[in-house]
């Protein structure tokens, strides 16, 4: 019983429960394939508890293994649109620091209009995650169709 | 060592580990797009630890941020079936209380026969989640093809 | 404060934080549909903390409910390739002990070149998970396109 009380009094941050769920803010200018994200209760159901946004990109604040997940839906899309504009590809990676740059997760749309996936990956404090959408098709900004998030799982 | 023993003696509920994984029970009558779920060890590998079922819909018992995931496979389906019956769409949302009604997750099948996704979202005690499948195609009841679950992640 | 220190001194294993993320090593010989996995920091971003590999298949070391996730991308693939070679199917299941053999997760590629999904499932110490890819198409070995992992969620 004492343990349960102690646990409740501990700040959640000390338990390492960093978590974020973001919604699409906007796409970049023509030569910039990055998606720009936003989060916070004023915007709806998005939030950041631990990680931060740096110019629309997600920056990690705690070392550990994270579950990274994403769903992106194309805004104006049918199976014929998707195949005619192929390849349209979504990649999630560490984009800074440059020394740690790597692609973590990559999917192509082919004849579909939505991609969704998730993976476990080690991330370090200061890692910035970028989500690159290559191709000419635009993503939907609907919050139930396009979202991106991370969840700290263990040290 | 004492801490480890204490932890094991604590009821899991006090740690907030609410979790559920459901299998499809049946679809609704003609004008009802909802999927009706079931869970429990007698049914196979489905279970409810914390959340409850209310007339086949999942009701949350603990406030917090949850990972919600779903996979739905159409029962008699090929890429031509899926495109001919387009749009077939799956939406997961809070359907009650009405004041909190919102779509959390939405995917269309286009030329595919399976959708699968996941997201982090805040849920409150009493929220009921509904999964709406719109269109004329029926979902598979195979437990490895169609399932729906939630996992409490943090307060 | 004492609790936080105690928690940090505890071996993570006692908290039940078993987790693994694997990358594709190779496919099996002609009559063997299994994918063979590998993991470890020397290989990149894959790892095993708790579970072990047994001849390229993942063996569970701790009873509990796990989140199992997978993404498989076909190596030389377009929507026409995928539909021409249909059915290409990926199934994740318990393959040993034989008494517990069951399919946990199943997806077909149809006209897509990537499948990705996740589910919660109870697993027991000694369960070995196999991932069967049926059909003639080969999976990509790119670590951002094909991966398989588990995360212990609760007892």
């Amino acid at each position: 019983q004492r343990f349960a009380q102690a646990q409740q009094q501990l700040p959640l941050e000390s338990l390492g429960w960093d978590v974020a769920e973001l919604q699409l803010n906007h796409t970049g200018p023509q030569q910039d394939p990055r998606l720009y994200w936003q989060g916070g209760p004023a915007l709806g159901r998005s939030f950041l508890h631990g990680p931060e946004l740096d110019k629309g990109q997600l920056r990690i604040h705690r070392d550990g293994i994270y579950m990274v997940h994403i769903q992106v839906t194309l805004a104006i899309c049918s199976s014929t649109t998707a195949s005619r504009h192929h390849p349209t590809t979504l990649a999630v990676g560490i984009c800074s620091p440059a020394s740690r740059s790597i692609s973590l997760l990559r999917l192509s749309f082919h004849q579909g209009c939505t991609i969704a996936s998730q993976r476990l990956t080690p991330l370090a404090r200061g890692d910035t995650l970028c989500t690159n959408l290559t191709g000419t098709l635009l993503p939907s900004r609907n919050t139930d169709e396009t979202f991106f998030g991370v969840q700290w799982v263990r040290p | 060592q004492r801490f480890a023993q204490a932890q094991q003696q604590l009821p899991l509920e006090s740690l907030g580990w609410d979790v559920a994984e459901l299998q499809l029970n049946h679809t609704g009558p003609q004008q009802d797009p909802r999927l009706y779920w079931q869970g429990g060890p007698a049914l196979g590998r489905s279970f409810l630890h914390g959340p409850e079922l209310d007339k086949g819909q999942l009701r949350i018992h603990r406030d917090g941020i949850y990972m919600v995931h779903i996979q739905v496979t159409l029962a008699i389906c090929s890429s031509t079936t899926a495109s001919r019956h387009h749009p077939t769409t799956l939406a997961v949302g809070i359907c009650s209380p009405a004041s909190r009604s919102i779509s959390l997750l939405r995917l269309s099948f286009h030329q595919g026969c399976t959708i699968a996704s996941q997201r982090l979202t805040p849920l409150a005690r009493g929220d009921t989640l509904c999964t709406n499948l719109t269109g004329t195609l029926l979902p598979s009841r195979n437990t490895d093809e169609t399932f729906f679950g939630v996992q409490w992640v943090r307060p | 404060q004492r609790f936080a220190q105690a928690q940090q001194q505890l071996p993570l294993e006692s908290l039940g934080w078993d987790v693994a993320e694997l990358q594709l090593n190779h496919t099996g010989p002609q009559q063997d549909p299994r994918l063979y996995w590998q993991g470890g920091p020397a290989l990149g971003r894959s790892f095993l903390h708790g579970p072990e590999l047994d001849k390229g298949q993942l063996r569970i070391h701790r009873d509990g409910i796990y989140m199992v996730h997978i993404q498989v991308t076909l190596a030389i693939c377009s929507s026409t390739t995928a539909s021409r070679h249909h059915p290409t199917t990926l199934a994740v299941g318990i393959c040993s002990p034989a008494s517990r053999s069951i399919s946990l997760l199943r997806l077909s590629f149809h006209q897509g070149c990537t499948i990705a999904s996740q589910r919660l499932t109870p697993l027991a110490r000694g369960d070995t998970l196999c991932t069967n890819l049926t059909g003639t198409l080969l999976p990509s070995r790119n670590t951002d396109e094909t991966f398989f992992g588990v995360q212990w969620v609760r007892p």
């Epitope: 919604q23 803010n25 906007h26 796409t27 970049g28 200018p29 023509q30 936003q38 004023a42 915007l43 709806g44 000419t136 635009l138 900004r141 919050t143 | - | -």
Partner: nanobody, 116 residues
Framework: QVQLQESGGGLVQTGGSLRLSCTAS????????GNWYRQAPGKQRELVAI???????NYADSVAGRFTISRDSAWKALYLQMNSLKPEDTAVYFC??????????WGQGTQVTVSS
């Protein structure tokens, strides 16, 4: 309350052209995207064209190569140039502006009828 107002609809013969305009009754700040939707009788509302704050555009398959979306620099107006019109383009056309903070502004719609 800001209102959007469409104009430029009407009756036109197959192969003809129309230019739809959409103007705001007040100032809308931080616009992320301008969109044109259409709704034909008995059908769902369909997104036909998008223009982003950065100037990127996308079109539905059914109108690509025939329709062009544009805007003025201050987002005071949104336009849809429709060429080579077909009977299947007959619908009520709605303009929509969405802000970065997820507010949505809609017009009342303008009827476009293409006769054969």
């Amino acid at each position: 309350q800001v209102q959007l107002q469409e104009s430029g609809g009407g009756l036109v013969q197959t192969g003809g052209s129309l230019r739809l305009s959409c103007t705001a009754s007040g100032s809308i700040f931080d616009i992320a995207r301008g969109n044109w939707y259409r709704q034909a009788p008995g059908k769902q509302r369909e997104l036909v064209a998008i223009i982003t704050s950065g100037g990127a555009t996308n079109y539905a398959d059914s109108v690509a190569g025939r329709f062009t979306i544009s805007r003025d620099s201050a987002w005071k107006a949104l336009y849809l140039q429709m060429n080579s019109l077909k009977p299947e383009d007959t619908a009520v056309y709605f303009c929509n502006m969405e802000t970065f903070s997820y507010r949505n502004y809609w017009g009342q719609g303008t009827q476009v009828t293409v006769s054969s």
